[in-house]
């Protein structure tokens, strides 16, 4: 059912990284516009992205209110220039999104190595604690603030002169690893949430090598 020349949205997809969350859908509109609504399972519907010709809607402001809630969105289709028009059932044509739980499903963004500091045969590698758009008491929370001990990092490293790699784990944002004196090393990190079954790992950070800015070295 539906009004003439109006088609329902389809392929509703959540795209979310570090809680920045956008709902995308198809098709590109021809003589129609869209409005999005979002709600928690028990909450009221809230309208966003009114009468837009875009095929995406940023819902970050809504989901960051409680990232552990499960959200549902729906996309309404209206004829362009006649947004009061309804379908044959007396309401606009719409399509539901899959459910989305930000805490369990947001992708982990690519981490960044903030610094490394060598003291003798030890190197301390620090991972930047990425800021998210989740707020508490009017301040933005970091990834660690949100995930706590659920968040870990995996370090991959090698001597600059060798292809053989090693790995280390931490559930903080710091690694302390043993290195050979006089050798330079290259590092990359990956974020991980061990308790998840999907979207568990981030992509690797850019590789950072000793002797190329970033670090401090003390004998």
């Amino acid at each position: 059912s539906g009004t003439t020349n109006t088609v329902a949205a389809y392929n509703l997809t959540w795209k979310s990284t570090n809680f920045k969350t956008i709902l995308e859908w198809e098709p590109k509109p021809v003589n129609q516009v869209y409005t999005v609504q979002i709600s928690t399972k028990s909450g009221d519907w809230k309208s966003k992205c009114f009468y837009t010709t875009d095929t995406e809607c940023d819902l970050t402001d809504e989901i960051v209110k409680d990232v552990k809630q499960t959200y549902l969105a729906r996309v309404f289709s209206y004829p362009a220039g006649n947004v009061e028009s309804t379908g044959s059932a007396g309401e606009p044509l719409y399509e539901n999104s899959p459910e989305f739980t930000p805490y369990l499903e947001t992708n982990l963004g690519q981490p960044t190595i903030q610094s490394f500091e060598q003291v003798g045969t030890k190197v301390n590698v620090t991972v930047e604690d990425e800021r998210t758009l989740v707020r508490r008491n009017n301040t933005f929370l970091s990834l660690r603030d949100v995930f706590g001990n659920d968040l870990g990092y995996i370090l991959t490293y090698r001597k600059s002169s060798s292809s053989g790699k090693k790995t280390a784990k931490t559930n903080t944002n710091e690694f302390l690893i043993d290195v050979d004196k006089g050798e330079n090393y290259c590092f990359s990190v990956q974020a991980v949430i061990p308790s998840r079954t999907v979207n568990r790992k981030s992509t690797d950070s850019p590789v950072e090598c000793m002797g190329q800015e970033k670090g401090e070295f003390r004998e």
Epitope: I154, I177, P194
Partner: antibody, heavy 117, light 107 residues
Framework: QVQLVESGGGVVQPGRSLRLSCKAS????????MHWVRQAPGKGLEWIGL????????IYDPKFQGRFTISADNSKNTLFLQMDSLRPEDTAVYYC??????????WGQGTPVTVSS | DIQMTQSPSSLSASVGDRVTITCKAS??????LNWYQQKPGKAPKLLIY???SLADGVPSRFSGSGSGTDYTFTISSLQPEDIATYYC?????????FGQGTKLEIT
């Protein structure tokens, strides 16, 4: 449910090669680190190496580096262990295991490899 | 590389006894230590992870403690089905290393 099934073991002559497979079901290997572990008859467990199937990164115990190669085919959800220049001391049961970052939570049943002339 | 020294290598105890196995790491492994049980012809089974956490479905008579370099695995009241070989595994950094194993028998 989650399952890992190894195959490809058998009897092989010293100096030859063998490729073991580990077929995963119930999850996507690219979401996890995957490992190979072996156990010689009557001996303890020995870690061989790991792969991050998402990007192909591999890390080995140095004693296996160069002779053993871990790879993955994400489209087949399968892990591989290529073993070259095999020696009698490589005789063992070979296990693949899934790593959830805090522990190896699932293991295969193991596939036996015998290196003998 | 981190060495794991597990002791004892074998142990004989009676049903109902308290059994303790230790693993000592050559450096701080920050609790990245697991304990596995292995029965003949079977794959290892996870009992304890992150040094102290009991794996799902594992009886509460099994426990783990420790931090830094020293770790302990305890069976509070030995049962006949606990006859197996037990291994510790450090996975804080590569190469990951297992202890040599402790073969547990019932007297």
């Amino acid at each position: 449910q989650v399952q890992l099934v190894e195959s490809g073991g058998g009897v092989v002559q010293p100096g030859r090669s063998l490729r073991l497979s580990c077929k995963a079901s119930g999850f996507n290997i690219k979401d996890y680190y995957m490992h190979w572990v072996r156990q010689a008859p009557g001996k303890g467990l020995e870690w061989i190496g790991l792969i991050d199937p998402e990007n192909g990164n591999t890390i080995y115990d140095p004693k296996f580096q160069g002779r053993f190669t871990i790879s993955a085919d994400n489209s087949k959800n399968t892990l591989f262990l290529q073993m070259d220049s095999l020696r009698p001391e490589d005789t063992a049961v070979y296990y693949c295991a899934r790593d959830n970052s805090y522990y190896f939570d699932y293991w295969g049943q193991g596939t036996p490899v015998t290196v003998s002339s | 590389d981190i060495q794991m020294t597990q002791s004892p290598s074998s142990l004989s105890a009676s049903v109902g006894d308290r059994v303790t196995i230790t693993c000592k790491a050559s450096q701080d492994i920050r609790k990245y230590l697991n304990w596995y049980q292995q029965k003949p012809g079977k794959a290892p089974k996870l009992l304890i992870y992150y040094a102290t956490s009991l794996a799902d479905g594992v009886p509460s008579r099994f426990s783990g403690s420790g931090s830094g370099t020293d770790y302990t695995f305890t069976i509070s009241s030995l049962q006949p089905e606990d006859i197996a070989t037990y291994y510790c595994l450090q996975h804080g950094e590569s190469p990951y290393t297992f202890g040599q194993g402790t073969k547990l028998e019932i007297t």
